[in-house]
């Protein structure tokens, strides 16, 4: 066992001479992003104050390619890198095409309306006039490709004029536009060469030891890894913590059960019920507030102030009133919960599916004519599953090196 331990320690650290270095640099696991849209069935009725009705469409599946670049080894046992992602649509795995039309809330109009609720009435009336002139409505009919990767919208120019410096988009707006062909920030993580106990843990993200999106030191902490590998020799008492640039926060998953993936022993980690709980139910989350119902997290502070919320798909594990407020939602543990299956000896993921939902809080706002009589509601826009499983040659090598060899050595 000590020989095995030495082999593991030698081969998991971030070091060009280690076995897992290339695996860390260019993840050989095929990752897929499966996106499900909530097609709004009754936009006119919602504007009259009726309950929203949605229909899930999808999945629209993309192969996700990741590669690390600008890899720089520092002299404090850390390495800095940028990880780029590109997405390629997979028609054969998808239920529909990127040219499918989806009726969706107009995030720019409805987001701007909520953001301007407490602004002077004059500004709101100017916005109404502008929205009318520009033909901007509360709901839009756009293709999957446009929603994902961006569409030209004159409202982007208008928002940049009236709210300068707040909006990360120029000319085009798309929900996943910032992810494609771009990096998720400069990560600096510990290599484990000098101190294996800190391996993969994030030292800094974009040069920061903590973020400032939230209202408490605890919520602003950058904890855990960058979300791809974890320290070795896990136990059922271990937790799986990582910093997510997309959620602008650290997340902690808990051990659920032991299992086997393709002959390799694994630990399954899942989201605790408290992950998106509000501050009154789980006080440590108070720093993520102001909160609405429990089970959704306000990400407006890191998403250009738009009233966007993150949760489990279909408001799974959230306050039931959220799913009841929208016809067509059916939360289901099997279909909508996230998991990561980790090989506990190495801390390397074997099989994972991270599922999250993005929703928009919308309501009628006095002075913004386009909001009609919309009753306050958190309306799901889409949910996605980012999934990957080790396979092929990589799996074979992994099984041989880390399951078969130790067994042989043991005997």
């Amino acid at each position: 066992p000590s020989l095995i331990k030495q082999q593991v320690l030698k081969n998991v650290r971030i070091d060009p001479s280690s076995l897992s270095f290339n695996m860390w640099k260019e993840i050989p696991i095929p990752f897929y992003l499966s996106v499900y849209f909530f097609d709004v069935m009754n936009p006119s009725e919602i504007l009259k104050g009726e309950k929203p009705q949605v229909r899930e469409r999808g999945p629209y599946v993309y192969r996700e390619f990741r590669h690390k670049s600008n890899i720089t080894f520092n002299n404090n046992d850390t390495v800095s890198f940028l990880e780029y992602r590109t997405f390629q649509f997979q028609p054969s795995k998808s239920h529909g095409s990127e040219s499918d039309y989806i009726v969706m809330p107009n995030i720019l109009v409805l987001g701007a309306a909520v953001m301007m609720e407490n602004k002077p009435m004059t500004l709101k009336l100017i916005m109404t006039l502008a929205f009318t002139t520009l033909g901007e409505r509360a709901f839009m009919n756009r293709t999957v490709g446009e929603i994902m990767w961006g569409y030209k919208d004159p409202l982007v120019n208008l928002i940049n004029k009236y709210f300068p410096g707040m909006f990360p988009f120029k000319d085009k707006f798309g929900l996943f536009a910032e992810l494609n062909n771009s990096d998720s920030g400069l990560f600096t993580v510990f290599t484990g060469v000098q101190n294996i106990s800190r391996i993969h843990l994030v030292d800094k993200w974009n040069g920061l030891s903590k973020v400032d999106f939230w209202h408490s030191d605890q919520c602003n902490m950058i904890n855990g890894t960058s979300g791809q590998m974890w320290p070795p020799f896990m136990t059922p008492e271990s937790s799986l913590e990582f910093y997510s640039p997309e959620a602008c926060r650290s997340m902690k998953l808990m051990y659920k059960e032991s299992g086997v993936f393709e002959g390799i022993p694994t630990y399954r980690f899942v989201a605790p019920k408290t992950l998106f709980a509000n501050g009154s139910i789980y006080p440590p989350n108070e720093g993520f507030c102001p909160c609405l119902e429990s089970g959704i997290q306000n990400v407006s502070t890191c998403r250009f102030s738009a009233p966007l919320f993150l949760s489990h798909p279909h408001f799974l594990n959230a306050d039931p009133v959220l799913a009841e407020a929208v016809t067509g939602l059916h939360p289901n543990q099997e279909a909508h919960s996230l998991f990561l299956d980790i090989h506990p000896v190495t801390g390397i993921p074997m099989n994972c599916s991270v599922k999250l939902q993005l929703s928009l809080y919308m309501k009628s706002v006095a002075g913004i004519g386009q909001t009609g009589k919309i009753e306050p509601v958190v309306l799901p826009l889409l949910w996605f599953a980012e999934s990957g499983a080790m396979e092929g040659e990589t799996l074979h090598t992994f099984y041989t090196q880390l399951v078969l060899m130790p067994k042989v050595m043991h005997y």
Partner: antibody
Framework: EVQLVQSGAEVRKPGTAVKISCKVA????????IYWLQQAPGKGPEWMGL????????IYAEKFQGRVAITADTSTDTAYMELSSLKSEDTAVYYC????????????WGQGTLVTVSS | VLTQPPSASGAPGQRVTFSCSGS????????VNWYQQLPGAAPRLLMH???QRASGVPDRFSGSKSGTSASLAITGLQSEDEADYFC???????????FGGGTKLTVL
């Protein structure tokens, strides 16, 4: 479907004021913002101001600021536009218009009211 | 603020194009609407968001934009198309919509 019905033609002397009405029919008055536009002979329309009848909030174009007052009477489903200190160049057709909720642009217009300013 | 030629003409069945010239604070940054005004009538929304036909408008009408200019095209010209055509856009510097002076179309 919403319709806008305006009051009849008016003749005024310079320096006086005129008040035009615009009645909303076919739908709930307070669901619609009402816009007022001026169209001088041989010219394109010019936006003057708007009102949200729900709470009588208004904004006006800089050109007409101080001379125009837009009001709404929810008991009669009617919006009004009053233009004061009239000059001969105010001779024009005045339109009320709206955008039916969920539509784009000014897609519903009143029939127009001709105001002639002459001494 | 938006400049349109005062007149245009075409024979029935022909194609006619109207131009509308603006600046970076209006057409250059935002979408364009087109209105049709028949003699003695109120303007009627014809095209919105540059290239989208308003409800009930036949597909003989089409709109486009390039840089700080926009255009409206009518194919298969008909006598009932004889009217004034106005372009409109949001203007940044005026915080309001601006209209062109209009182009009078005569069907020969």
């Amino acid at each position: 479907e919403v319709q806008l019905v305006q009051s009849g033609a008016e003749v005024r002397k310079p320096g006086t004021a005129v008040k035009i009405s615009c009645k909303v029919a076919g739908d709930t008055f307070t669901d619609y913002f009402i816009y007022w536009l001026q169209q001088a002979p041989g010219k394109g329309p010019e936006w003057m101001g708007l009102i949200d009848p729900k709470d009588a909030q208004t904004i006006y174009a800089e050109k007409f600021q101080g001379r125009v007052a837009i009001t709404a009477d929810t008991s009669t489903d009617t919006a009004y536009m009053e233009l004061s200190s009239l000059k001969s160049e105010d001779t024009a057709v005045y339109y009320c218009a709206t955008d039916s909720v969920g539509s784009a642009g000014f897609d519903v217009w009143g029939q127009g009211t001709l105001v002639t300013v002459s001494s | 603020v938006l400049t349109q030629p005062p007149s245009a003409s075409g024979a029935p069945g022909q194609r006619v194009t109207f131009s509308c010239s603006g600046s970076g604070s209006n057409i250059g940054s935002y979408t364009v609407n087109w209105y049709q005004q028949l003699p003695g009538a109120a303007p009627r929304l014809l095209m919105h968001t540059t290239d989208q036909r308003a409800s009930g408008v036949p597909d003989r009408f089409s709109g486009s934009k390039s840089g700080t200019s926009a255009s409206l095209a009518i194919t298969g010209l008909q006598s009932e198309d004889e009217a004034d055509y106005f372009c409109a856009a949001w203007d940044d510097s005026l915080d309001g919509p601006v209209f062109g002076g209009g182009t009078k179309l005569t069907v020969l």
